[in-house]
């Protein structure tokens, strides 16, 4: 797996040690995760034909993946930085159970899947520091997450492949929207 941002020897020597909440640091963290998702998508698409499948709706019924909507204030139209920051953090927290599901779904990219999961945890910490004054952030219920995980793992092979593909695609879209929004914060 690639070296996470801030752990590269060039960075360590750099005199401009940035606070963890700095715009550049958060941006780098998101891009690092996106690179990881890219690698995972490559394996998924090579292994199955899910990336071209038109039957996504069947699997999507079982999933409640976080998605940006107008009301979340993360788009150019109706942008609201406080509402949006809450949505980004809440969404990332909700994605964690799905990232846990991905952990045993990869053969050659097992390390990459772990890196995406761990880097997301770090990103959440960065953003929570940035949003220290916001108290509207709800954490998902562990019991609900555990039963969701069990349900997802009990699916047949085709649905598991499709679920993996949908999680990666949705997470990528969520992070790209977050990147655009955070630029204006």
């Amino acid at each position: 797996a690639p070296v996470p941002p801030g752990e590269d020897s060039k960075d360590v020597a750099a005199p401009h040690r940035q606070p963890l909440t700095s715009s550049e640091r958060i941006d780098k963290q998101i891009r690092y995760i996106l690179d990881g998702i890219s690698a995972l998508r490559k394996e998924t698409c090579n292994k199955s034909n899910m990336c071209e499948s038109s039957k996504e709706a069947l699997a999507e019924n079982n999933l409640n993946l976080p998605k940006m909507a107008e009301k979340d204030g993360c788009f150019q139209s109706g942008f609201n930085e406080e509402t949006c920051l809450v949505k980004i953090i809440t969404g990332l927290l909700e994605f964690e159970v799905y990232l846990e599901y991905l952990q045993n779904r990869f053969e050659s990219s097992e390390e990459q899947a772990r890196a995406v999961q761990m880097s997301t945890k770090v990103l959440i910490q960065f953003l929570q520091k940035k949003a220290k004054n916001l108290d509207a952030i709800t954490t998902p219920d562990p019991t609900t997450n555990a039963s969701l995980l069990t349900k997802l793992q009990a699916q047949n092979q085709w649905l598991q492949d499709m679920t993996t593909h949908l999680i990666l695609r949705s997470f990528k879209e969520f992070l790209q929207s977050s990147l655009r929004a955070l630029r204006q914060m």
């Epitope: 640091r25 891009r31 655009r180």
Partner: antibody
Framework: EVQLLESGGGLVQPGGSLRLSCAAS????????MSWVRQAPGKGPEWVSR????????YYGDSVKGRFTISRDNSKNTLYLQMNSLRAEDTAVYYC?????WGSGDYWGQGTLVTVSS | QTVVTQEPSFSVSPGGTVTLTCGLS?????????PGWYQQTPGQAPRALIY???DRHSGVPDRFSGSISGNKAALTITGAQAEDEADYYC?????????FGGGTQLTVL
């Protein structure tokens, strides 16, 4: 068409204060972070300050920290820069600019000249 | 304080290609620094050419292009014209602030 119009510049004595304004039109002002950039005569541009789209976060260059305050009024589509304890080295043309993003670049105004001299 | 470095001056023949660079005194330039390029002619406000590494500002001719090459941001002018003679400044987001380079004076001769 994006337009940014700075005003409020002028001649002020060292130690004095000045408040710059920037009236924005032609884009969704409340969706963009905004910056002030200055350029001293014969020098390159120097970033001064930035404020987030909703006004919740502000950032400053080392040379103005503690003396300048950036603010905005999204209901009036206006950006401000309150400059206190002015020094001769603050003499420059001050430009306001929106932060590139949402698929479009940054636009700059034509600037307002601030001269700090006794 | 991280310094943003640019070549002080450069010259190019009309029709020629020139690449101006923008680096950091320590570390590499990445997409997270959102490299931007500005052109300034005497008596005028700086004009944005490129934002976010390689996106061309509206109305900017396609002979101007941006990239990250190696550990630096780069502005390439392909088929330079007399009106391209100007000062060129790059800007990088570093942490929470923005730093401008000292500028490159480009001569077209």
């Amino acid at each position: 068409e994006v337009q940014l119009l700075e005003s409020g510049g002028g001649l002020v004595q060292p130690g004095g204060s000045l408040r710059l304004s920037c009236a924005a039109s032609g884009f969704t002002f409340s969706s963009y972070a905004m910056s002030w950039v200055r350029q001293a005569p014969g020098k390159g541009p120097e970033w001064v300050s930035r404020i987030s789209a909703g006004g919740g976060s502000t950032y400053y260059g080392d040379s103005v920290k503690g003396r300048f305050t950036i603010s905005r009024d999204n209901s009036k589509n206006t950006l401000y820069l309150q400059m206190n304890s002015l020094r001769a080295e603050d003499t420059a043309v001050y430009y306001c600019a929106n932060r590139a993003g949402w698929g479009s670049g940054d636009y700059w105004g034509q600037g307002t000249l601030v001269t700090v001299s006794s | 304080q991280t310094v943003v470095t640019q070549e002080p001056s450069f010259s190019v023949s009309p029709g020629g290609t020139v690449t101006l660079t923008c680096g950091l005194s320590s570390g590499s330039v990445t997409a997270s620094n959102y490299p931007g390029w500005y052109q300034q002619t005497p008596g005028q406000a700086p004009r944005a050419l490129i934002y976010s590494t390689n996106d061309r500002h509206s109305g900017v001719p396609d002979r101007f292009s941006g990239s990250i090459s190696g550990n630096k941001a780069a502005l390439t002018i392909t088929g330079a014209q007399a009106e391209d003679e100007a000062d060129y400044y790059c800007a990088l987001d570093i942490g929470d602030i923005t730093e401008f380079g000292g500028g490159t004076q480009l001569t077209v001769l």
